[in-house]
């Protein structure tokens, strides 16, 4: 709690590390020679720049940040990534029909700075 | 509003045949997958199985492998449950329910058809 | 027997804080969700919890979920004698895709 201390985004609405909505096809993500269902995924993902401070997931981000602001060159920037995931159930195609296989790490539910 | 409603209670001989629906309205029929689920008298909840109204695929529990059979007719917006051969075991509350929008969980559920298969 | 097990009965008084637990293995909860059902008497099941810890819209925010390790439970607090019923938990299964726990009936005494 102590590290995610930052929900402001300095650089404007929208632009720093937050969960975003794109709609694909399966044939956008490749699967379509694999997956039957759904046809069209809401795919939720992390986008967006990692500030000072901003969603710092742990202690290590913050060092990571104050690091970057001293050796940019040596040092990235916090990277936007998944704090959690919501499951997804897909029907696939199988050798004898079909099946149910649940992905549990899918679609970012929420973001923060890693 | 989001509603499923299924056909009436059934009384039935051993032997046989059977077939209740579930119709959907309030959204789109064929953008939501729709699961059965039994009910036998005073105990749990049981999967039976899944369709994808779309492209009818059907998926079973194997607990219920061949001995149902769920389908669907989109043009009217209903999904089927079906036994060819009633068995006094089957004596239930049947649930239809559609799944939530990762097909991870049921977020509406019909109001049950009761079975009663009694000789 | 279920894959999921849920103790058969609990009880509490109005305004109590009750706790339903759902215990499974590393094939169901232990890697994935889990989801609570609630059913009155004499009526169809209805969602109350999904992904271990979301309330849909119109659930009272006296009903929370949480996972932890292999098992899951469902906190009711501030309990009223309205949420009298059946609970369930489900998950899935390797094995068997959708799974529910046994049930567990909830008694608000008094």
């Known amino acids: 709690a102590r590290a995610r201390n930052g929900d402001h985004c300095p650089l404007g609405p929208g632009r720093c590390c937050r969960l975003h909505t794109v709609r694909a096809s399966l044939e956008d993500l490749g699967w379509a020679d694999w997956v039957l269902r759904p046809r069209e995924v809401q795919v939720t993902m992390c986008i967006g720049a990692c500030p000072s401070q901003f969603r710092a997931a742990n202690m290590h981000a913050q060092i990571k940040t104050s690091l970057h602001r001293l050796k940019p060159d040596t040092v990235p920037a916090p990277c936007c990534v998944p704090a959690s995931y919501n499951p997804m159930v897909l029907i696939q195609k199988t050798d004898t029909g079909v099946s149910l296989q649940t992905y549990d790490d899918l679609l970012a539910k929420d973001c923060h700075c890693i | 509003e989001v509603q499923l409603v299924q056909s009436g209670a059934e009384v039935k001989k051993p032997g046989e045949s059977l077939k209740i629906s579930c119709k959907g309205s309030?959204?789109?029929?064929?953008?939501?997958?729709i699961g059965w689920v039994r009910q036998m008298p005073g105990k749990g909840l049981e999967w039976m199985g899944v369709?994808?109204?779309?492209?009818?695929?059907?998926i079973y529990s194997p607990s219920f492998q061949g001995q149902v059979t769920i389908s669907a007719d989109k043009s009217i917006s209903t999904a089927y449950l079906q036994w060819s051969s009633l068995k006094a075991s089957d004596t239930a509350m049947y649930y239809c329910?559609?799944?939530?929008?990762?097909?991870?969980?049921?977020?509406?559920w019909g109001q049950g058809t009761l079975v009663t298969v009694s000789s | 027997q279920s894959v999921l097990t849920q103790p058969p009965s609990v009880s509490g008084a109005p305004g109590q804080r009750v706790t339903i637990s759902c215990s499974g293995s590393?094939?169901?909860?232990?890697?994935?969700?889990v989801n609570w059902y609630q059913q009155l008497p004499g009526t169809a099941p209805k969602l109350l919890i999904y992904s271990n810890d979301n309330r849909p819209s119109g659930v009272p925010d006296r009903f929370s979920g949480s996972k932890s390790g292999t098992s899951a439970s469902l906190a009711i607090t501030g309990l009223q004698a309205e949420d009298e019923a059946d609970y369930y938990c489900q998950s899935w299964d390797s094995s068997s895709n959708y799974v529910f726990g046994g049930g567990t009936k909830l008694t608000v005494l008094g």
């Open positions: 329910a559609r799944y939530g929008r990762y097909g991870t969980y049921f977020d509406y």
């Open positions: 309030g959204y789109s029929f064929t953008s939501y997958w």
């Open positions: 369709i994808d109204p779309s492209g009818s695929y059907t």
């Open positions: 590393s094939s169901n909860i232990g890697v994935l969700y």
